[in-house]
């Protein structure tokens, strides 16, 4: 028998520095977790102790903190090289800055193979990107070789900016011939490493003949066997075992997100490459694990540029940006409008001639807007200003909801109106009218939404049975501020870009902003 140790991360999302337990900015260092310096300590410890070790990443290193905003992926290549990753799969967020924003900082600089079997380049891009990412890689490990085949969510064109010269094929259809090639080459230990979410990971384990292990990402799935060490609730045991259609037991793993855990899976193979046993657990990277001094010093060196950036002007406002709780928790506020407009702008994807855009709607809990920005400071808006407005380090995500769920959400928005509570919704691409004289649960008297399947966008009444795409904070997608109906009834959820980054990019693009209160939210006569 031959034993392989797979160390894995996924959805790290720019968490190069250690974070608090909830993966936001580290405040009390003695209770902080993760970060590449701490990760390196643990990885090196395992490499020294065990003979056959692979360190793999299942995508979405890009996007999530000011590190990515400033360094644009160069930080990913630099620190992944320093940690000596063996391979990485492309995630959807790796395309956030377009194909050029992937090629130059990461694909050309990475010292490890970057993989995806279901992304096919065409046109002029084909020769430019040739060899910079691969469908699979054969890696020598000890006296054996291991094949790693990559995959990426086929929804990427709706979630990021891969452009028109990359085709995202069905994962299973694309993986099978590449696995067959590895088998042809007498590679009999094969890992599928990719970024399509836990449901697809399980399908790959079930359907792709020849895959021995699946290491996934995208859905931030936490798996654990035994008593979990922190706040994350396991979605199942680690590894999660899938019985394949040809009767094999295939371990599937994922390691939550944000570099909080290091996935640790031990696989035993027989001489024919069959999995005999698999066991392990994610390792919580808490403060009991010291940060590696040399990596930490490098982080501190790179950090200097971030501090300079946060005080630089992104753009100007010529109006007061009202982000006060007195406004945003009671009525339409122009800070809410600005943020929602930025959220929609960040999701402009012309992927179908029938649609002017794939999504037109935004909702945003007023309680998530934490500060106004005064225009009387020469109109200057900095990252620092935006960090005061959006201090929680969240993301603006894409969900699919039925009209009936949206109606419930808007009823919840005003079910206890007047108490300055955070659930009051700010909107974009939505016109809502409330009648507060009616009883809670029946206060939405008009709810019109901007069409997407139209050449001239206009507002139409919400249809209860129709499925709509909506951009919203991850906080709401996870049922925050009492929006349990969103969490319980959402049909799809894809995590998006860092909230501050979305707004800062929009302001930089617009240069000068002047958001107004324009009648998106109204109250019917006599009730307010």
């Amino acid at each position: 028998a031959w034993e392989l140790t797979i160390l894995h991360t996924n959805d790290v999302h720019s968490r190069l520095e250690q974070t608090s337990e909830d993966s936001s900015k580290c405040v009390n260092a003695s209770r902080c977790m993760g970060g590449v310096a701490r990760l390196f300590t643990k990885v090196q410890q395992i490499r020294r102790a065990e003979p056959n070790v692979l360190l793999l990443d299942a995508g979405d290193q890009y996007q999530g903190t000011i590190w990515f905003t400033v360094y644009k992926g160069a930080e990913v290549a630099h620190f992944m090289n320093a940690l000596r990753y063996d391979a990485m799969a492309l995630g959807n967020h790796e395309f956030d800055n377009g194909v050029e924003g992937l090629i130059e900082p990461l694909l050309k600089e990475a010292k490890f193979p970057i993989l995806s079997a279901n992304i096919k380049a065409k046109g002029p891009l084909a020769s430019q990107i040739s060899g910079l990412y691969l469908p699979y890689k054969v890696l020598p490990v000890g006296d054996e070789v291991v094949g790693i085949v990559g995959y990426t969510s086929k929804e990427t064109p709706f979630l990021s900016n891969p452009g028109t010269n990359l085709v995202f094929e069905d994962e299973i259809t694309a993986l099978q011939p590449e696995v067959d090639k590895l088998k042809t080459l007498n590679v009999n230990k094969i890992i599928a490493l990719g970024h399509s979410g836990f449901e697809m990971d399980k399908l790959i384990a079930q359907k792709v003949r020849g895959v021995d292990v699946v290491v996934g990402g995208h859905s931030n799935t936490f798996l654990y066997t035994g008593n979990p060490p922190s706040k994350e609730v396991p979605a199942g045991k680690y590894p999660f075992i899938v019985t394949s259609d040809d009767g094999r037991k295939v371990p599937v793993v994922q390691a939550y997100a944000f570099g909080k855990y290091l996935g640790y899976l031990k696989i035993e193979f027989d001489e024919r490459g069959n999995v005999i046993s698999s066991h392990g657990n994610p390792i919580l990277l808490n403060s009991s694990i010291p940060e590696d001094p040399s990596i930490k010093a490098d982080i501190n060196k790179w950090r200097i540029k971030l501090d300079n950036y946060s005080t630089q002007e992104l753009g100007k406002t010529i109006v007061y940006l009202d982000g006060s709780s007195q406004s945003c928790r009671f009525r339409e506020c122009n800070m809410g409008n600005l943020i929602c407009d930025a959220m929609i702008n960040n999701n402009l994807r012309h992927t179908d001639e029938m649609f002017w855009n794939h999504v037109s709607m935004c909702i945003l809990n007023g309680g998530g807007i934490r500060s106004p920005i005064d225009e009387r400071n020469n109109g200057t808006i900095t990252w620092e200003n935006l960090a005061a407005v959006l201090p929680f380090g969240g993301t603006f995500d894409l969900v699919q909801l039925k009209g009936s769920t949206l109606k419930k959400a808007f009823e919840h928005s005003v079910h206890r109106y007047g108490q300055s509570t955070g659930e009051f919704l700010q909107v974009g691409g939505i016109h809502v009218v409330y009648d507060l004289s009616r009883k809670p649960g029946d206060r939405v008297v008009k709810l019109d939404v901007l069409c997407t399947k139209c050449r001239v966008p206009s507002y139409d009444p919400l249809k209860m049975d129709e499925v709509y795409k909506v951009i919203l904070p991850n906080f709401l997608a996870n049922g925050g501020d009492g929006f349990q109906m969103i969490k319980d009834e959402l049909l799809r959820h894809d995590s998006g870009d860092q909230d501050i980054n979305v707004v800062s990019t929009y302001i930089s693009k617009m240069k000068v902003i002047y958001p107004a209160v324009e009648g998106r939210i109204k109250f019917s006569t006599g009730s307010h």
């Epitope: 490890f112 193979p113 890689k137 042809t184 007498n186």
Partner: antibody, heavy 118, light 107 residues
């Protein structure tokens, strides 16, 4: 662009050893395989061995085990092949070639002519 | 070791002709076959791999086919620049082995 620059021609005596080099540029060295191949004048090609630059792992054609030894220097992005106990049969052109997987040789060096003669 | 046999050491052709260069493996190599072109005084150049996949930048008048033990490199409408030695190679099992080569000449 991708380049593999091999060292110059060598004239050596039987029984001696020689160290051939292959300096690379334009691709990710550490995640590449470098193979060495032999071609005698007017003849076909013979694969000698490969080395995975990232780890220094090697695999040899049994015929060349003990004769060839492959190493890499990642800092200079250079692959080396030491050829020992030379005989006249070892006179040939030696190529280094880069491949990303266990398969075809994508890019080749220009070749080094080795002449073993007393 | 797997033996790759190119039965024609030489093939005579004219510019504009279509030519088939064949290669036979001593056992099934499951399309793990590459083709190379070598001109005098130059190193080999990859044309095709996995029997039929054209390497980036290779003109599309080079095509490959085959399965099992029999493989063919087809040059549609031969050009003067195509006159060279052509080798097949199997990478199904180590040691990787090459055919003896086929020299394409002008009639």
């Amino acid at each position: 662009q991708i380049q593999l620059q091999q060292s110059g021609a060598e004239l050596v005596k039987p029984g001696a050893s020689v160290n051939l080099s292959c300096k690379t540029s334009g691709f990710t060295f550490s995640s590449s395989y470098i193979s060495w191949l032999k071609q005698k004048p007017g003849q076909s090609l013979e694969w000698i061995a490969w080395i995975y630059a990232g780890t220094g792992t090697t695999r040899y054609n049994q015929k060349f085990t003990g004769k060839a030894q492959l190493t890499v220097d990642t800092s200079s992005r250079t692959a080396y092949m030491q050829f020992s106990s030379l005989t006249t049969e070892d006179s040939a052109i030696y190529y280094c070639a880069r491949h990303v997987n266990w398969d075809h040789f994508e890019y080749w060096g220009q070749g080094t002519t080795l002449t073993v003669s007393s | 070791d797997i033996v790759m046999t190119q039965s024609h050491k030489f093939m005579a052709t004219s510019v504009g002709d279509r030519v088939n260069i064949t290669c036979k493996a001593s056992q099934d190599v499951s399309t793990a076959v590459a083709w190379y072109q070598q001109k005098p005084g130059q190193s080999p150049k990859l044309l095709l791999y996995w029997a039929s996949t054209r390497q980036t930048g290779v003109p599309d008048h080079f095509t490959g086919s085959g399965s099992g033990t029999d493989y063919t490199l087809t040059i549609n409408s031969v050009q003067a620049d195509d006159l060279a030695l052509y080798y097949c190679q199997q990478y199904y099992r180590t040691p990787w082995t090459f055919g003896g080569g086929t020299k394409l000449e002008i009639k």
